[in-house]
């Protein structure tokens, strides 16, 4: 309706004696600005006067002046929009209707607001969610339809009278739509909160109690259970009886079903709060609990560990680890179901009691082959002694033991023989699967562990074998001691150190590199003639006639070996020189005569000198002196001299006779 003024404000405001009221208010006048404002308490329209009667709480005039007694009520508005009011303090008799009389130049309006002032602070109101379930967070809301700037308040949450530890969010609203103070507290209720009293307490600024609201928490939760057992320690012997009782300490809503579980599995036909176990067996040992359900879900009690005691059962032995390697450590574990656990153990090795071994475990730090065999044990607890079980077998593995290389041949072995060797061992686990030989050669292995050496060499000194399973064990090397004729026989000149000159003292040595057996004999030979039987051949004064091809022989019981021929060379100055004449020592003049200087020399003559009967050297230096044509004057005695690196030699005189030719005689 366009003929109305438009106002916005809360319909009713709430407060209490001594507090204050803040009235948020907005308006829109029909025309122009506000010229007059009167706040009435319970206004009534007087038809006669056409005016409103009632207590005037506030009045503003055109000049804007307010009487001093009106300080309690304040108009905080303006001339065109805001009509906010404040009453501080507010009194009980302020309850009722407030009338806002507004006048502009041409229009008038009366706006009514309800004010509800109580004698004491009214309580806040707690709002709970429709359902609260354990461990699911909920928000508790405490709402108070009051807020005023001049009167600070606080809302405090209490649980069973004690401030709650959870944080709250407090908000206030002072708007034209609503006026309130609200506190929201979010928390995770536990089952233990069920039935507890939650309070929202209204306090003034100093924390003084003003009012409160309380609610009882209805926390839906699964049944909370306690289990009781007779006997209380839940330790019994086979044949005894056990009673377990399930008590529900809390359930919301009420429980519907009961069941019992053993080791997590439901026990059939056990649907009461008491579980009776008569004449229990050891199989009934385990973890028992009761489960009670309601609409929220199942609740379980704590577990009771029922121990049915019995004497040890036949034991078994566990070996860590078999097979075991010699030198490693091994642990034996005696396993025997018993309750209480065995306190004493007796151990057996191959049926014989092991002294001083009374623990559940036997530890052998260094296993030896003799530890192999069957291990068994007997367990004992307070209820009796168990039976000895079948036992466990310890297999101790080790490399082949006491490996030897054996020569099968009759001794001695001669070079070129066929030698057979075998590889023997004392014991092995696992069995020997192969053999190795050192040194390696192109040899036959006619059967496992046998080696055949065809045409054995003189230098096959030692042979070793290894017997192998998972490991190889080597035997000590065996000496073949191969016998052979002397080797590498050779002639060696000991003296002189340089070349041999005629007259020198000469020693020749007959050397050889090896001989087996060591006992040897020597033989020297020249041109098939035996010269000596010592290792050395000595010449006190060598002569050229001693030169020649020498051999030495060395023999032992196996055979004899000759050296290569060794040439003995004797160096000497030219000797046995003579002048030979060709065609003869008498030559006719005019013919040719050749004189040759013949000699024996080593090294051969390198230089010749010719002399005449006057010992005059002739200008000829070759071995032959050719006279052509020969003259009668050439007749006379001639001699030659030969020179080599050792020295000189001269021939005796040889006479050449040159006779006249028939022509010359004819001319005479």
């Amino acid at each position: 309706d366009s003929s109305k003024w438009v106002f916005e404000h809360p319909e009713t405001l709430y407060a209490w004696e001594g507090a204050c009221v803040w009235i948020p208010c907005t308006y829109r006048a029909l025309d122009g600005d506000l010229e007059s404002f009167i706040l009435f308490h319970n206004p009534e329209y007087n038809k006669n006067t056409s005016k409103f009667d009632g207590t005037r709480l506030y009045e503003s005039t055109k000049d804007g002046k307010v009487p001093s007694e009106q300080k309690r009520v304040q108009f905080l508005g303006d001339k065109n929009k805001n009509c906010t009011l404040s009453i501080h303090p507010v009194h009980l008799n302020d309850s009722g209707q407030l009338g806002l009389r507004m006048e502009s130049k041409t229009e008038k309006w009366m706006e009514r607001i309800h004010l509800n002032v109580s004698e004491r602070p009214f309580p806040p109101h707690i709002q709970l969610p429709p359902e609260i379930q354990e461990s699911q967070e909920v928000t508790l809301t405490c709402l108070l339809n009051f807020s005023c700037y001049g009167y600070p308040i606080q809302l405090q949450w209490l649980l069973e009278g004690v401030p709650m530890r959870q944080a709250a969010v407090t908000s206030t609203s002072l708007t034209i739509k609503s006026v309130f103070t609200r506190s929201e507290l979010k928390f995770s209720p536990q089952w233990s909160h069920h039935g507890k009293i939650v309070t929202c307490q209204l306090q003034d600024a100093d924390g003084k109690f003003l009012s409160n609201d309380t609610v009882q928490l209805n926390v839906k939760h699964t049944p909370k259970l306690e289990i009781k057992v007779t006997p209380s320690d839940a330790i019994v012997r086979e044949g005894d009886s056990v009673t377990m009782t399930c008590e529900v300490s809390s359930s919301n809503p009420e429980y519907t079903t009961v069941s019992w579980l053993k080791d997590g599995t439901s026990l059939k036909k056990q649907n009461t709060f008491t579980l009776n176990l008569r004449e229990v067996t050891k199989d009934q040992s385990g973890k028992y609990c009761c489960q009670v359900s309601n609409d929220v879900g199942p609740g379980r009690s704590e577990e009771v560990f029922l121990q049915v005691q019995y004497a040890p059962e036949p034991s078994t032995v566990q070996i860590l680890h078999s097979p075991a390697v010699e030198g490693s450590q091994v642990e034996f574990l005696c396993m025997s179901l018993a309750n209480p656990l065995p306190t004493n153990y007796t151990w057996y090795h191959n049926g014989k009691e092991m002294q001083g071994r009374t623990e559940e475990k036997v530890h052998i730090p260094k296993i030896l082959p003799w530890h192999a065999g069957t291990y068994s044990c007997v367990a004992e607890n307070i209820l009796g002694t168990g039976q000895r079980g079948p036992g466990a077998e310890l297999d101790v593995q080790y490399p082949p033991k006491k490996v030897t290389t054996v020569i099968q041949n009759p001794m001695p072995i001669r070079e070129g023989d066929t030698v057979t060797l075998s590889c023997n061992y004392n014991s092995s686990n696992p069995s020997v699967t192969r053999y190795e030989w050192k040194p390696h050669g192109a040899w036959e292995e006619p059967s496992l562990g046998v080696l055949k050496i065809q045409n054995v060499g003189w230098d096959n000194t030692t042979i070793a074998c290894a017997a192998c399973n998972s490991w190889c064990s080597w035997a000590s090397p065996v000496a073949l001691n191969v016998q052979y004729a002397p080797r590498d026989v050779r002639v060696r000149k000991i003296k002189p150190l340089s070349e041999i000159h005629s007259g020198n003292s000469v020693s020749l040595q007959c050397d050889f590199s090896s001989s087996h057996p060591k006992e040897v004999q020597f033989f020297w030979e020249k041109n098939g003639r035996l010269l000596g039987k010592e290792s050395q051949l000595n010449f006190d004064s060598i002569s050229p006639e001693d030169a020649g091809s020498y051999s030495c022989w060395v023999n032992n019981s196996i055979g004899q070996t000759a050296s290569k021929a060794w040439t003995l060379e004797v160096l000497y100055a030219p000797r046995r020189l003579r002048v030979s004449m060709s065609p003869g020592d008498q030559v006719m003049e005019g013919k040719s005569a050749t004189l040759t200087c013949e000699s024996d020399a080593n090294p051969p003559v390198s230089h010749y000198t010719w002399f005449d009967w006057n010992n005059q050297s002739l200008p000829y230096h070759s071995q032959k002196l050719r006279l052509e044509p020969v003259k009668v004057q050439h007749s006379g005695a001639y001699w030659c001299q030969g020179t080599n690196s050792v020295g000189k030699g001269r021939s005796p005189l040889s006479t050449l006779t040159v006779y006249y030719s028939p022509e010359t005689i004819g001319r005479r």
Epitope: Q136, Q154, R165, A168, V169, F187, S188
Partner: antibody, heavy 119, light 106 residues
Framework: QVQLKESGPGLVAPSQSLSITCTVS????????VHWVRQPPGKGLEWLGM???????DYNSALKSRLSISKDNSKSQVFLKMNSLQTDDTAMYYC?????????????WGQGTLVTVSA | QIVLTQSPAILSTSPGEKVTMTCSAS?????MYWYQQKPGSSPRLLIY???NLASGVPVRFSGSGSGTSYSLTISRMEAEDAATYYC?????????FGAGTKLELK
């Protein structure tokens, strides 16, 4: 025993977003609240927000527009996501669990992950 | 939000001396919580619900107070107590911490 461990990127460029994971053990995320707290170098502690056992969240109003907290109960992981990082977001970021389900002081803390906001 | 003011900001003391630090709240809080933090480490809860000692905390530490005024006391200072101490409120969101009191050894 109760344990919490944060893992983060270390370095974040300005205006980029930050993701940190808190992996927990020794308790169920469906029953306990987990909170995030940060501490700039050489400064004090600032509460960022929390996630409840049921999954609802509460944030520090000063950061609410940039923050998001979520979780995966089956993986025992809580996630913090923060957008539009600036250099003053450089801090050690901690996840913490209260003494009780939802109150009682932070009895359990992670070792923290240092986040540096820098170009 | 509730502002917590810790004083003094820095406190120097000798071993064996009694130490008291305070935490003042801008409005009433129900309980106060105290933490100890050493360089390079996460904070450690010392006191919960104003006066209860957290697990493993030496008995020389104690807390007290109500309303807006709370304090933490160390009956006999030890070298290992040198650290920064923070108070924290859990009454109103957002949860807030004090700026800290740095406790040093003289």
């Amino acid at each position: 025993q109760v344990q919490l461990k944060e893992s983060g990127p270390g370095l974040v460029a300005p205006s980029q977003s930050l993701s940190i994971t808190c992996t927990v053990s020794g308790f169920s995320l469906s029953r306990y609240t987990v909170h995030w707290v940060r501490q700039p170098p050489g400064k004090g502690l600032e509460w960022l927000g929390m996630i409840w056992g049921g999954g609802s969240t509460d944030y520090n109003s000063a950061l609410k527009s940039r923050l998001s907290i979520s979780k995966d109960n089956s993986k025992s992981q809580v996630f913090l996501k923060m957008n539009s990082l600036q250099t003053d977001d450089t801090a050690m970021y901690y996840c913490a669990r209260p003494h009780d389900f939802d109150a009682g002081g932070f009895a359990y803390w992670g070792q923290g992950t240092l986040v540096t906001v820098s170009a | 939000q509730i502002v917590l003011t810790q004083s003094p900001a820095i406190l120097s003391t000798s071993p064996g001396e009694k130490v008291t630090m305070t935490c003042s709240a801008s409005s009433r809080v129900n309980y106060m919580y105290w933490y100890q933090q050493k360089p390079g480490s996460s904070p450690r809860l010392l006191i919960y619900d104003t006066s209860n000692l957290a697990s493993g905390v030496p008995v020389r530490f104690s807390g007290s107070g109500s309303g807006t005024s709370y304090s933490l006391t160390i009956s006999r200072m030890e070298a290992e107590d040198a650290a920064t101490y923070y108070c924290q409120q859990w009454t109103s969101y957002p949860l807030t911490f004090g700026a800290g009191t740095k406790l040093e050894l003289k």
